[in-house]
Amino acid sequence: KSPIFGPEEVNSVEGNSVSITCYYPPTSVNRHTRKYWCRQGARGGCITLISSEGYVSSKYAGRANLTNFPENGTFVVNIAQLSQDDSGRYKCGLGINSRGLSFDVSLEVSQGPGLLNDTKVYTVDLGRTVTINCPFKTENAQKRKSLYKQIGLYPVLVIDSSGYVNPNYTGRIRLDIQGTGQLLFSVVINQLRLSDAGQYLCQAGDDSNSNKKNADLQVLKPEPELVYEDLRGSVTFHCALGPEVANVAKFLCRQSSGENCDVVVNTLGKRAPAFEGRILLNPQDKDGSFSVVITGLRKEDAGRYLCGAHSDGQLQEGSPIQAWQLFVNEESTIPRSPTVVKGVAGGSVAVLCPYNRKESKSIKYWCLWEGAQNGRCPLLVDSEGWVKAQYEGRLSLLEEPGNGTFTVILNQLTSRDAGFYWCLTNGDTLWRTTVEIKIIEGEPNLKVPGNVTAVLGETLKVPCHFPCKFSSYEKYWCKWNNTGCQALPSQDEGPSKAFVNCDENSRLVSLTLNLVTRADEGWYWCGVKQGHFYGETAAVYVAVEERKAAGSRDVSLAKADAAPDEKVLDSGFREIENKAIQDPRLFAEEKAVADTRDQADGSRASVDSGSSEEQGGSSR
């Protein structure tokens, strides 16, 4: 007995599509072996039509695909544009066609519905609109027009030209009589329900000379599209419901027990707590289409999702809908990285962001998720040398360590930095990841002076005190600019006296600027790293002024404490040109991120997602 299982009989109609699911024992070998769909010949052979290794027969070109779902031990063969020629006996199987690991499937495609017995067939998706056209003769032009639905043996009046509307259709049906030139009336039914399906009769006149027309209304539930994404990765649901619902509230919901569909996000401002910080509903286009991006995919995100339109912002009978079945692949190509990073006020964080290592040349971005309205993620920094103005001197995106990971360093932390941040690139959109920054109680580990003033032509020495916990780390000074932080020579001055209960392993490392010039003005960072992995940093702003008295400047921590607040220095900053694009459509198109910039400073949410993967600001 073969361990492969599937549907023994599949029946469909011409022009339709089928999705045939074949089940196999999900052993390691089976997961990775060839999957195939073949047609059995009269003489016993089985000719491959499509396989998981990329082969597609010319008979199936452009209308079929085979998708393997190793997590579930299934593969699915989708065949569209069916014709009666597709009727026959098939096998779905694993390995080689002639071996026994297969299951026999009978596919029968019958003739599509036509104008049989003068019946017009209307095939419409659930929630959409149908227009039933009813012709009549001149003698019935002034007579009553009506539409009936056949319920069992009895016709039940649905609507007529005298104003009657059956209660089941209230608010979603109308009868239109065309201009005098056209001998036609139409009945338009909106927000179609499954219960609307059936036989209808339209009639003009009530006597034996009345004109009658039969209609068969078929209401289809939408085919769920199978979506298969990696754990920790990202998914985008593109929802196109048609221009007729362009001004109706939109929603994405996830089916839970039974037929309940819990709202994930909607355009009325509702968002499920489980998706805080990792979801965006993109502004909709004029045609009513919109998209929803979810990052940081979790195992529990798998399930059936519906998008739709309804004034309540949630699924109701008659909502036009689109459906997806999301599978989350736990054998993910996306590496684990901390979902929570903790830092202290005044301190720093170093965030590791994964990207697809095949796209090392892609532009890297970091953005701040904002929960207002439908969610947005204005960019803060990119790998091409752009940094949002408010973050100058305290934010840097580094290509290190490379090979599938980049680093974002943010220092001078305040409570306003708490929130959710997204790592992304202009390449593979599935690699968007989310990290939450939490600001916790504590003191920064690195001690530097506040803001420092250097004198033109003189020497300036700036100290950085490293506690003993960083004894094994490499210590450095660098000068910040838009493209990163260029390393500078520094001197180890021996043990630091800035730490209580810290032994000889503490260190004072100084930055020396000889013969200061105007070009030396700017932000300097001291920090620690291990190889290409960065730890904590501390920032100092060095201002440069004209000589007042001779000599060199040696800055101490005591002087630093009295330094003016950093806001005083703002006027001295070079303002980066405003690269903002209003209403940034960051994720509306897969590649649209490339030139999106946003300078607006919005509210920042700080929500505890309860993640178990946490990272302190000073560790990696």
Epitope: S12, N16, I20, T74, K221, R304
Partner: nanobody, 127 residues
């Protein structure tokens, strides 16, 4: 409240035929998949047959033990399910349960896939 009600069970002779029916009510939307399972005392519920609807396509699944003898049919708009059983054998004796799965996902043969269940109808085949 969702209800699935089976009917048509009874006592028959080996090689006789029987038709089981199941009517579902209270499902907010029509079910995407319905199935028949059976259980004998002291054993786990086992898959018999299932039918799935998607768009205008119908998919029928059978356990090897009933292939060629049992035929599953139904109407997803009306949420009805039938099981025509021919050539019945004593080993077909069991309580037969009707099940509905609105979501169409998960293995058709696994009872845990189905969210709604009937109370069962007894089928006894005597030799």
């Amino acid at each position: 409240e969702v209800q699935l009600v089976e009917s048509g069970g009874g006592v028959v002779q080996a090689e006789d035929s029987l038709r089981l029916s199941c009517a579902a009510s209270g499902l907010p939307f029509s079910s995407s998949r319905m199935g028949w399972f059976r259980q004998v005392p002291g054993k786990e519920r086992e898959f018999v047959a299932a039918i799935g609807w998607s768009g205008r396509s119908t998919y029928r699944y059978y356990d090897d033990s009933v292939k060629g003898r049992f035929t599953v049919s139904g109407d997803n708009a009306k949420n009805t399910l039938d099981l025509q059983m021919k050539g019945l054998k004593p080993e077909d004796t069991a309580v037969y349960y009707c099940a509905a799965d609105p979501n169409y996902y998960g293995d058709v043969r696994t009872s845990g896939t189905y969210q709604y269940w009937g109370q069962g109808t007894q089928v006894t085949v005597s030799s």
